[in-house]
Amino acid sequence: KSPIFGPEEVNSVEGNSVSITCYYPPTSVNRHTRKYWCRQGARGGCITLISSEGYVSSKYAGRANLTNFPENGTFVVNIAQLSQDDSGRYKCGLGINSRGLSFDVSLEVSQGPGLLNDTKVYTVDLGRTVTINCPFKTENAQKRKSLYKQIGLYPVLVIDSSGYVNPNYTGRIRLDIQGTGQLLFSVVINQLRLSDAGQYLCQAGDDSNSNKKNADLQVLKPEPELVYEDLRGSVTFHCALGPEVANVAKFLCRQSSGENCDVVVNTLGKRAPAFEGRILLNPQDKDGSFSVVITGLRKEDAGRYLCGAHSDGQLQEGSPIQAWQLFVNEESTIPRSPTVVKGVAGGSVAVLCPYNRKESKSIKYWCLWEGAQNGRCPLLVDSEGWVKAQYEGRLSLLEEPGNGTFTVILNQLTSRDAGFYWCLTNGDTLWRTTVEIKIIEGEPNLKVPGNVTAVLGETLKVPCHFPCKFSSYEKYWCKWNNTGCQALPSQDEGPSKAFVNCDENSRLVSLTLNLVTRADEGWYWCGVKQGHFYGETAAVYVAVEERKAAGSRDVSLAKADAAPDEKVLDSGFREIENKAIQDPRLFAEEKAVADTRDQADGSRASVDSGSSEEQGGSSR
């Protein structure tokens, strides 16, 4: 017997859609082999109608698709605009039609639900509004108008012109009688529920001369859109519920058991703890549409998601909704990278950010996730030479090591730097990743003086003390600027005396600036690296002043200024503007990144955690 499984019988009506799921054992071979849907002929052959290799028969053009979900061992055939001609026997299968693994499916399409003559059919989405129009003749103009719902064999009054409203419809129904010129009354039902579906009868008058009109109301639940994303990657749910709910609270929820739907995020400020640091709900447009971005996808994020609108900010009967089924592919193209990076106050972190290696020329960004309101992610740095003002001298985005990974270095850490940060590019929006920076107890490993003053025309020597743990690392000095950190020559001065219990492997490496000029003023970093992988860094600000007394300056650790945790950067800058990034491509709105950089002096940066993989500040 075949290991393929699916529905043996599918029954539907003309004009409807069906979604046929076929289940197969998810072996490596099965996951990658051809999937097909074919129609069995009278002589025993099976004519392919659609396959996973892109073939679509002319009979199915524009109305069918086949989607494979290898992680789940399923593929789904969606067929829309059914007609009675689609009735027949089919196979869903793997491999070659004639000798592949398959399952027989019988599809029967009938003419549609039995409707009374002169029945008007209203097909409306769940949560939306329907207007049932009821014509009448002049003799009934002054008589009672009413709408009944057929329940079993009996009509039940829903609303009438004397003011009665059935309790099931309270607060969401009204009866409008048009002006004297029009012989028509309307019943408007909003926040439609699935239970509202059925046969209705509207009536003008109560005697044998009354006017009657039949209506069939079909309330459609949303078919879930199938979404398939990579583990550690990102997903964007675009939710367009229509202008009529533009001012109603919006939500995204995840279905659990039954009809329970746990709020993931809503516009009332609620956010599920599991999504802290890795979710953004973008501001809604005037038409009520909005998007939710989730990064750092985890296996447990898979499931059914609904977005909707309701004043409570959660799913209620009558909420207009959209649905998605999210599958998380564990055979991810997105490499593992640490989701937690630890640093100490005054120290540094080096964060590795993956990107799609096919997009090496894309612009890279690093932004801070902020949880206030619906979440935002102000940019801190990009690969085109822009650094947010208060991060000057302590933040750098490097294209190294390249080939699918870039590096972000942040030093002079304070407790305020703890939080979630996002790595992203202006290319593939699925490659948004998150990292959490944690500030832990401890001392920085590299020791440098605090602030240093050099004298014009003289020589300045700045020391950097490296403990023995970095004996095998390359040690360097560089001058920081917006585009990176340009390497400078340095001298190995032998073992350092700055460390207790540290042997000859510790090192004192000095930066020497000869004949200091005004151009030498700025931030200098000393650091360690192994090849193209960066470790810890320490920063020193060199100020340049006029000569007061002759001689060269040799700065020692004893002359260091205030503790790094007390350093206040750019405190004199006025706040220019406060734009949070809702792009680059964060919400696929293709806004120019230059217009959305956060230049506010007051905002800080962050990113997100996915699993418990961790990385110390100096590890690769």
């Epitope: 529905p7 009506v13 399923t74 639900p113 949303p222 879930p224 009809e259």
Partner: nanobody, 129 residues
Framework: QVQLVESGGGLVQAGGSLRLSCAAS????????MGWFRQAPGKEREFVAA??????????YYADSVKGRFTISRENAKNTVSLQMNSLKPEDTAVYYC????????????????????WGQGTLVTVSS
């Protein structure tokens, strides 16, 4: 809370027929899934048949062991699902459980017990040889 009540079980001779019914309390499910599972003495509970629906579309699923002998159907107005069992065999002897999932969105593999939110108490079917 939805409650499921099974009926129709009993003793029947091999080759005979029985019709099991499962009634769901509460409002009608406008979309969802109901299924039948069975558990023979000393064995694990196994899938028998299921029916999923949404609007005017229904999907019927059967285990290989009952294909061609059992038929699942649903009566919308009464919120009931029936299992017509023909050509019964002694190996069909088991407690038959009704299960349901009430959802806005169709679920996963109908053979999986975790796909159902509500379960009945079960009805015993005994097929004598």
């Amino acid at each position: 809370q939805v409650q499921l009540v099974e009926s129709g079980g009993g003793l029947v001779q091999a080759g005979g027929s029985l019709r099991l019914s499962c009634a769901a309390s509460g409002r009608a499910f406008s979309s969802g899934r109901m299924g039948w599972f069975r558990q023979a003495p000393g064995k694990e509970r196994e899938f028998v048949a299921a029916i999923s629906w949404s609007g005017h579309t229904t999907y019927k699923y059967y285990a290989d062991s009952v294909k061609g002998r059992f038929t699942i159907s649903r009566e919308n107005a009464k919120n009931t699902v029936s299992l017509q069992m023909n050509s019964l065999k002694p190996e069909d002897t088991a407690v038959y459980y009704c299960a349901a999932r009430q959802s806005l969105v169709a679920g996963g593999d109908p053979r999986g017990q975790s796909e159902y939110d509500y379960w009945g108490q079960g009805t015993l079917v005994t097929v004598s040889s």
